[in-house]
Amino acid sequence: LSVQQGPNLLQVRQGSQATLVCQVDQATAWERLRVKWTKDGAILCQPYITNGSLSLGVCGPQGRLSWQAPSHLTLQLDPVSLNHSGAYVCWAAVEIPELEEAEGNITRLFVDPDDPTQNRNRIASFPG
């Protein structure tokens, strides 16, 4: 089981939208996958994916979760507020028959105040 996460760094304006992406790869077939997003070490959500279907669409404040088979998990924060700033990590686990866990690298999200005097563009930095 492996997890690749991006971007490494995401800088967005307050009130806009932030999208964090996670790719989960598993060598053997799984019946039920458990995915998890954490922010600053606290769990936002940890739903199951069964038969390609996500059991829960909400993930933390203003967070929406989506799963695109076979391997893409997306967390969309909309609208972004200042307290969305932090370090996000995507995890995946197969719990049955044996536990197998994997975690992604950190995505650092920076949220700029909605200051009309500043004209700062959105910055996204992906690995590789």
């Epitope: 954490t38 070490g41 769990i43 940890q46 739903p47 199951y48 829960l56 933390g60 536990l99 866990e101």
Partner: antibody, heavy 118, light 107 residues
Framework: QVQLVQSGAEVKKPGSSVKVSCKAS????????INWVRQAPGQGLEWMGW????????NYNEKFKGRVTITADKSTSTAYMELSSLRSEDTAVYYC???????????WGQGTTVTVSS | DIQMTQSPSSLSASVGDRVTITCRAS??????LNWYQQKPGKVPKLLIY???RLHSGVPSRFSGSGSGTDFTLTISSLQPEDVATYYC?????????FGGGTKVEIK
């Protein structure tokens, strides 16, 4: 701070049911699994099952399947464990415990003593 | 179910002694092993997870090691407040199971 507060001691007759509650505070209840573990007098710990309150999904120890039901009420941040067809061997302290970031129990309730006696 | 066997079931040691508790799994559980401490009349407390990772707030005199089927909890210098029963737990395979416990007393 994270707290799990359980309901009070119960005395039950064989064949009856008991429902123990576990009220969570200090964290987002819907984000973390709540597990139930029991400990018979002078004995070790025995895992019974868990619930993920975010969606109500459960996983039970086969030993208790059919007799145990774990539920959660999101509106009150409370998890429940109901054990039916009680027998004397079910006399134990029942704990709720939160599963942490990984697969371990980082916070525990204070325990609820259930005594099964005729 | 995976059986977890702890040894010894009880031990008595002096303050400052190095204490070692072992836990053996009936089959390979890789590193999915946790250790808990339960003081008399109290609730279990997490000490170590994933074989060797110290839970926050746990004194550094506690350490864990092992992999596969054989695991060890070590208290490098026993303190009076360490009097308790220690339990290992495997979370590799459902149902999760605990060892029978090791009771640690002060001589």
């Amino acid at each position: 701070q994270v707290q799990l507060v359980q309901s009070g001691a119960e005395v039950k007759k064989p064949g009856s049911s008991v429902k123990v509650s576990c009220k969570a505070s200090g964290y987002t209840f819907t984000s973390y699994d709540i597990n139930w573990v029991r400990q018979a007098p002078g004995q070790g710990l025995e895992w019974m099952g868990w619930i993920y309150p975010g969606e109500g999904s459960t996983n039970y120890n086969e030993k208790f399947k059919g007799r145990v039901t774990i539920t959660a009420d999101k509106s009150t941040s409370t998890a429940y464990m109901e054990l039916s067809s009680l027998r004397s061997e079910d006399t134990a302290v029942y704990y709720c415990a939160r599963r942490g970031l990984r697969y371990y129990f980082d916070y525990w309730g204070q325990g609820t003593t259930v005594t099964v006696s005729s | 179910d995976i059986q977890m066997t702890q040894s010894p079931s009880s031990l008595s040691a002096s303050v400052g002694d190095r204490v070692t508790i072992t836990c053996r799994a009936s089959q390979d559980i890789r590193n999915y092993l946790n250790w808990y401490q339960q003081k008399p009349g109290k609730v279990p407390k997490l000490l170590i997870y994933y074989t060797s990772r110290l839970h926050s707030g746990v004194p550094s005199r506690f350490s864990g090691s092992g992999s596969g089927t054989d695991f060890t909890l070590t208290i490098s210098s026993l303190q009076p407040e360490d009097v308790a029963t220690y339990y290992c737990q495997q979370v590799n395979t459902l149902p999760w199971t605990f060892g029978g416990g090791t009771k640690v007393e002060i001589k």
